[in-house]
């Protein structure tokens, strides 16, 4: 997701088909306030960014509103009137869905079903990860809708759960970003808990000389 040009490193993120964030690391332009100009239609005039991201008092990015029908971003980053980087991109390639909202759990014997409100657009995977104190790594299960059932759980064990949303590669390509994880929720015997014991790490084998 990083484009390079004239000492400029660019990163694009398209948050939930709502907001585009373009950030830059302008190593060749220290102490310069680069300006960001953009449009969503080739025939329009460029608009200048109105919401800049600042780093150490200097511009390092722009946040701009997008609509779901906006799919190509034309942009130019300028030092004064001099363009230092100009590009046009399909912004769907840089999608980052929002985190799962209204997450709820329902327990039934040795299984738990996590549900949340589906996002309003297609091509997403809803991933649930879970682990007990006996697991050194998270286990994972994912579905096309936010209705994910994890089976074969031991009701006596304490399980930590977290969820996120990912863009399907078939729908958006391989260079998207997963959403942030939801808050970790802990459950034991069908009831919520503040926390589970930390996973046990296997003892390191002693090396014989």
């Amino acid at each position: 997701q990083v484009a390079t040009g004239e000492g400029l490193q660019i990163q694009i993120m398209y948050f939930n088909l709502e907001t585009v964030q373009v950030t830059w690391n302008a190593s060749h332009y220290p102490r310069s306030n680069l300006s960001f100009h953009y449009k969503f239609s080739r025939d329009e005039a460029y608009d200048q960014c109105t919401v800049y991201i600042l780093q150490e008092g200097h511009t390092s990015g722009c946040l701009l509103d997008a609509e779901q029908q906006d799919d190509i971003l034309y942009f130019s980053i300028r030092n004064g009137t001099h363009p230092v980087f100009t590009a046009s991109r399909w912004i769907f390639y840089y999608l980052k869905p929002s985190s799962p909202k209204q997450v709820s759990f329902s327990w039934h014997q040795d299984a738990v079903t996590l549900t949340c409100s589906d996002l309003s657009y297609r091509g997403l995977l809803y991933e649930v990860q879970y682990r007990s104190p006996f697991d050194t790594e998270w286990q994972s299960k994912q579905e096309n809708t936010c209705n994910v059932t994890v089976e074969d759980l031991d009701a006596e064990k304490c399980y930590a759960f977290r969820a996120r949303v990912k863009a399907m590669e078939d729908a958006y390509g391989p260079d998207t970003y997963p959403s942030d994880w939801s808050e970790v929720t802990c459950w034991q015997r069908g009831e919520t808990r503040d926390s589970c014991p930390e996973p046990r790490t296997p003892p390191k084998p002693k090396l014989s000389k």
């Epitope: 390079t4 190509i72 046009s88 769907f92 390639y93 590669e169 729908a171 390509g173």
Partner: antibody, heavy 122, light 107 residues
Framework: QIQLQESGPGLVKPSQSLSLTCSVT??????????WTWIRQFPGKKLEWMGY???????YYNPSLKSRISITRDTSKNQFLLHLNSVTTEDTATYYC??????????????WGQGTLVTVSS | DVVLTQTPATLSAIPGERVTMTCKAS??????LHWYQHRPNETPRLLIK???RSITGIPSRFSGSGSGTDFTLGINNLEAEDFAIYYC?????????FGSGTKLEIN
């Protein structure tokens, strides 16, 4: 098994319009998510993407062709059409129609026609 | 536009050899780079999508790698039918663009 077939005149006079048709069999051009494209190959073998029309009729054109290009479709015949105005000898090329791979918002082109050579000459 | 530079322009080899060719993008394009084979008098054929993902029906001797700006197509154990022109194409930049091609010819 999808097949694409281009058809149209092989010779066009400068300043006239070029119209080509791509007939698609074995697959509906209205299938959700798929985009239909025109690509041309110049005599020196360079390939140029010209434009797309989507399953939803949305079109995208190469800015280099400015306002000369139009892509339309005829769903009753399962065809999509290329119109290129004010042609010059620089438009002499082999014209291909192709299908864009589903997803990734118009990525790679997984099915192509055989191509039709169009010569612009007086 | 994102410019794709393919090298070498011509590659000479003999059947049974392994060859590699490269495609360099003027701007970073992640892994959204695709490879095509175009034999004379045939329709272009998609070989590799997204830098390294295989395509159903394409022999396993074709492989791709790379990300960002530098990409490679490799062909193991060359067969007579592999002698053709190979093109790379990027998709995140608008408009989509193709490289100028690498012609693989029999030595």
């Amino acid at each position: 098994q999808i097949q694409l077939q281009e058809s149209g005149p092989g010779l066009v006079k400068p300043s006239q319009s070029l119209s080509l048709t791509c007939s698609v069999t074995g697959f509906s051009i209205t299938t959700s998510g798929y985009y239909w494209t025109w690509i041309r190959q110049f005599p020196g073998k360079k390939l140029e993407w010209m434009g797309y029309i989507g399953y939803n009729s949305k079109t995208y054109y190469n800015p280099s062709l400015k306002s000369r290009i139009s892509i339309t479709r005829d769903t009753s015949k399962n065809q999509f059409l290329l119109h290129l105005n004010s042609v010059t000898t620089e438009d002499t090329a082999t014209y291909y129609c192709a299908r864009s791979l589903y997803g990734g918002y118009k990525d790679a082109f997984d099915s192509w026609g055989q191509g039709t050579l169009v010569t612009v000459s007086s | 536009d994102v410019v794709l530079t393919q090298t070498p322009a011509t590659l000479s080899a003999i059947p049974g050899e392994r060859v590699t060719m490269t495609c360099k993008a003027s701007q970073s394009i992640g892994t959204s780079l695709h490879w095509y084979q175009h034999r004379p008098n045939e329709t272009p054929r998609l070989l590799i999508k997204f830098a390294s993902r295989s395509i159903t029906g394409i022999p396993s001797r074709f492989s791709g790698s790379g990300s960002g700006t530098d990409f490679t197509l490799g062909i193991n154990n060359l067969e007579a039918e592999d002698f053709a022109i190979y093109y790379c194409q990027q998709s995140p930049g608008f408009p989509p663009t193709f490289g100028s091609g690498t012609k693989l010819e029999i030595n």
